[in-house]
Each structure stands twice: as structure tokens, then as C-alpha cells.
């Protein structure tokens, strides 16, 4: 005869363990049913009655089969610098990640605890290492023969255009200005960008320069002194 299937609660055979999705209740000394994800134990089992489970209440969750008396509280609502990438449900906690243009300065088990804005490289400085979901942008001074005239977290240093006759030589923050005759090699219009990090995927490809720090390319006068060595705007 086949062995009979034991229904919870049941006393396990000496030396054996409870089955999958069951737990051993020390008080009842029985194998009892666990509650499914999205539930918690409302009434613990006894020798004669199985665990009574209840659905997780408002804004609480359990992710695993369990016998906890209360569901876990979902984390607080995402802050203004974050987006909710996973909603709080009975079976999963809320996950907040940094919104475009920000990176995670302090992460937690899932999602981010503290977001910070991505550093913007000032004119004269370009992006050496782009920002990611968890790391800030690294800026570097534009090497001789290159420039950046934007305040941006994505623009790299671009080569100066090569002129037949130079009207104004380029510097780190301004392109060379040619005389009316065409340049030998004209740069394509628009800034050169590094690929956007995941956390900035919805940013516009051309960040608007800040007038106070990013001069217009139409100026024909040499620029003033170089910006500070960090090459980034204050956060």
C-alpha cells in the first residue's frame, strides 16, 4: 500500500523534516503550513488546527513563504529626486531609483536611499567618465586642440575646427573662429555627447547651457580666465 499523504498539521517522523512550504512549530510540535507570499500568519497552528493566513494589509508585503505574524511595511514613498520603478504590492516592496540626471549616492538592498544630481562639467572641461546609476560624472580639462563650451553632464571635449586662416584661436572653452573663407574641416553642428547612462535616458540630448557659465559660440572675443580645476558646477 502507498504511504498516506499527511495533511497539516502532522507530527513528523523522528529525524525527518517538514515538507516544502511547511514549517515546524515548536509549540505545537507539528509540521504546519506556511503562508504564501502576500500573506502572513494570523493564527498559528495547534495540534489540531493548521495555520490561518491572512492577506497583507495596506502598504505591507511578504515576498516569501512564511509564518510571520505581521507583513513587512513597504518603504516610504519615493522622494522627488526618485522614480518608483516597482510599486509596493502585497508580494514586493516599493523600489525607488534615481530620476534622470541623478545617480545613487547611497544605495540600499534594493533601489536607492539617497540620490544626488550628476555633476555638470563647466566650459573648458569635458566628461572623462560618464555617470551611471551608481557613480557620478568625472570631468577633465580639455586638452590643447579641444574645447567644450557647454555646462553639461554628457558633453565631451571636441576638437577645434581647423581653419585656412584663423581669426581667433580656440581655447579650452571656445572653438577656433575662422575668417570668412570656409574652414578646412568643419565640425558637425551640435555638441558631441557620451552615451547617456541608464539613469539619464530621458534627458534631452542637448542640455541647455547655463547663460552665466556657458558662453555663446557667437562671441568673437577671447574668453576670460579658466574655470576652477575641478571643472564642474557646484552640486
Amino acid at each position: 500500500l502507498p504511504a498516506q499523504v499527511a495533511f497539516t498539521p502532522y507530527a513528523p517522523e523522528p529525524g525527518s523534516t517538514c515538507r516544502l512550504r511547511e514549517y515546524y512549530d515548536q509549540t505545537a510540535q507539528m509540521c504546519c503550513s506556511k503562508c504564501s507570499p502576500g500573506q502572513h500568519a494570523k493564527v498559528f497552528c495547534t495540534k489540531t488546527s493548521d495555520t490561518v493566513c491572512d492577506s497583507c494589509e495596506d502598504s505591507t508585503y511578504t515576498q516569501l513563504w512564511n509564518w510571520v505574524p505581521e507583513c513587512l511595511s513597504c518603504g516610504s514613498r519615493c522622494s522627488s529626486d526618485q522614480v518608483e520603478t516597482q510599486a509596493c504590492t502585497r508580494e514586493q516592496n516599493r523600489i525607488c531609483t534615481c530620476r534622470p540626471g541623478w545617480y545613487c549616492a547611497l544605495s540600499k538592498q534594493e533601489g536607492c536611499r539617497l540620490c544626488a544630481p550628476l555633476r555638470k562639467c563647466r566650459p573648458g572641461f569635458g566628461v572623462a567618465r560618464p555617470g551611471t546609476e551608481t557613480s557620478d560624472v568625472v570631468c577633465k580639462p580639455c586638452a590643447p586642440g579641444t574645447f567644450s563650451n557647454t555646462t553639461s553632464s554628457t558633453d565631451i571635449c571636441r576638437p577645434h575646427q581647423i581653419c585656412n586662416v584663423v581669426a581667433i584661436p580656440g581655447n579650452a572653452s571656445m572653438d577656433a573662429v575662422c575668417t570668412s573663407t570656409s574652414p578646412t574641416r568643419s565640425m558637425a553642428p551640435g555638441a558631441v555627447h557620451l552615451p547617456q547612462p541608464v539613469s539619464t535616458r530621458s534627458q534631452h540630448t542637448q542640455p541647455t547651457p547655463e547663460p552665466s557659465t556657458a558662453p555663446s559660440t557667437s562671441f568673437l572675443l577671447p574668453m576670460g580666465p579658466s574655470p576652477p580645476a575641478e571643472g564642474s558646477t557646484g552640486d
Epitope: 503562508c35 504564501s36 507570499p37 502576500g38 500573506q39 494570523k42 493566513c53 491572512d54 492577506s55 494589509e57 495596506d58 502598504s59 510599486a87 509596493c88 504590492t89 502585497r90
Partner: antibody, heavy 117, light 106 residues
Framework: EVQLQQSGAELVKPGASVKISCKAS????????MDWVKQSHGKSLEWIGD????????SYNQKFKGKATLTVDKSSSTAYMEVRSLTSEDTAVFYC??????????WGAGTTVTVSS | ENVLTQSPAIMSASLGEKVTMSCRAS?????MYWYQQKSDASPKLWIY???NLAPGVPARFSGSGSGNSYSLTISSMEGEDAATYYC?????????FGGGTKLELK
Amino acid sequence: EVQLQQSGAELVKPGASVKISCKASGYTFTDYNMDWVKQSHGKSLEWIGDINPNYESTSYNQKFKGKATLTVDKSSSTAYMEVRSLTSEDTAVFYCARDKGWYFDVWGAGTTVTVSS
Amino acid sequence: ENVLTQSPAIMSASLGEKVTMSCRASSSVKNMYWYQQKSDASPKLWIYYTSNLAPGVPARFSGSGSGNSYSLTISSMEGEDAATYYCQQFTSSPYTFGGGTKLELK
């Protein structure tokens, strides 16, 4: 379009049982709990219980424990509620509702159960 | 169980009038949920997480409150708003509904 299609009205005798169905369409059936709500004529709403179609785990309002039994058939995306030992107190409209996680965003049209000899 | 008391039970309002109905819980709740029901129809989700309007709900509706006291407000009554409104809590089991507020057009 998300829809919950409930079975038709039932006229049953006292002491008998009735099994109401609720067929879900337009979404993944196992993604959301299904809840059942009772509304007696001219009265408010009473939560009976819910079932997680994924794990087939249930939770009940203590008042309806032993009175109602919730089950699902995942293959047909259908939830069922059986109500037993019917009395005149069980004459009501019974609704199934999709539980979006602490609110019922879609409701069935309701099944009227009349208990009469 | 957490008893939800809605007041008034019945009220009437003229077109354009501001309407406020309340829902008091015997124990504090995290959020309140509201449903609209018209005669011989199923309830419809109206407001969730205390103040979020369900899709398709006109902007003249709003929800507010915390703890034991919550309310639903219509800034300017329209004919189609005549219905019964129920509040519901999910903070403690069994999940309970209020007795409803029947809103009629004056």
C-alpha cells in the same frame, strides 16, 4: 480591456449550496488577487475574502469562514465562490473584484442569489 | 473589526454646489478608498490611496484625510454625480466598507 464576467442569477432552496463563477479576461489572471463582496438588497458592501490565483492561497472575513469557499481554475482564468447551507440571509448580489493591491479596480456585474423555498 | 461610519447617510445638492461627505474609522487607517455605485450597477473605483482619482474620474472630485477621519469632496455638483459613495479600508482584516452616502440631485 479588463473584464470580469460572472455567472447568471441563481434561485436556490434553503440548505442548498451555490457555486458562482467569475471569468477574467484582458490581463494575466495570476497577477492579481480576486476578492468577493456581498451586497444585500439596499445594504452596504461586505468583504467575503480573497484568493491569490498564483498560489491558490485564501484569506477570509471570519464571518464568512465555513460559509464561503474560494477556488480558482488557472487554465480557464476563472475564480469560483461556493456558498453553502444557504438561508434567506444569503439572498444578495455577490461581486467578484480584481484586487490591484488594496483597491478593487475592476468589478464583475454581480450575481444575484435568491434563497427561497 | 474596524467600523467605518459615513455621514451623512443621505444628502442632496444643487448643480454647481460644493459637496463634502465624510468617513470616520473606529481605528486609525493608513489610506481610504472610495467607490461610486449607481442603482442596479456594480461599484466603481473612484478614489484610491486617499487622494488619487481613478482613471476617468472628473477632476472636480478630491479625497483627503488621515488617521480616523477622511472625506470626499466634489467642488461643483453635476447631475452625473448623483450616486451612492462607499469608503473602504484595507489597514486591518476584515477589510470593511462604510454604510455609504447617498448623494441626490436637488
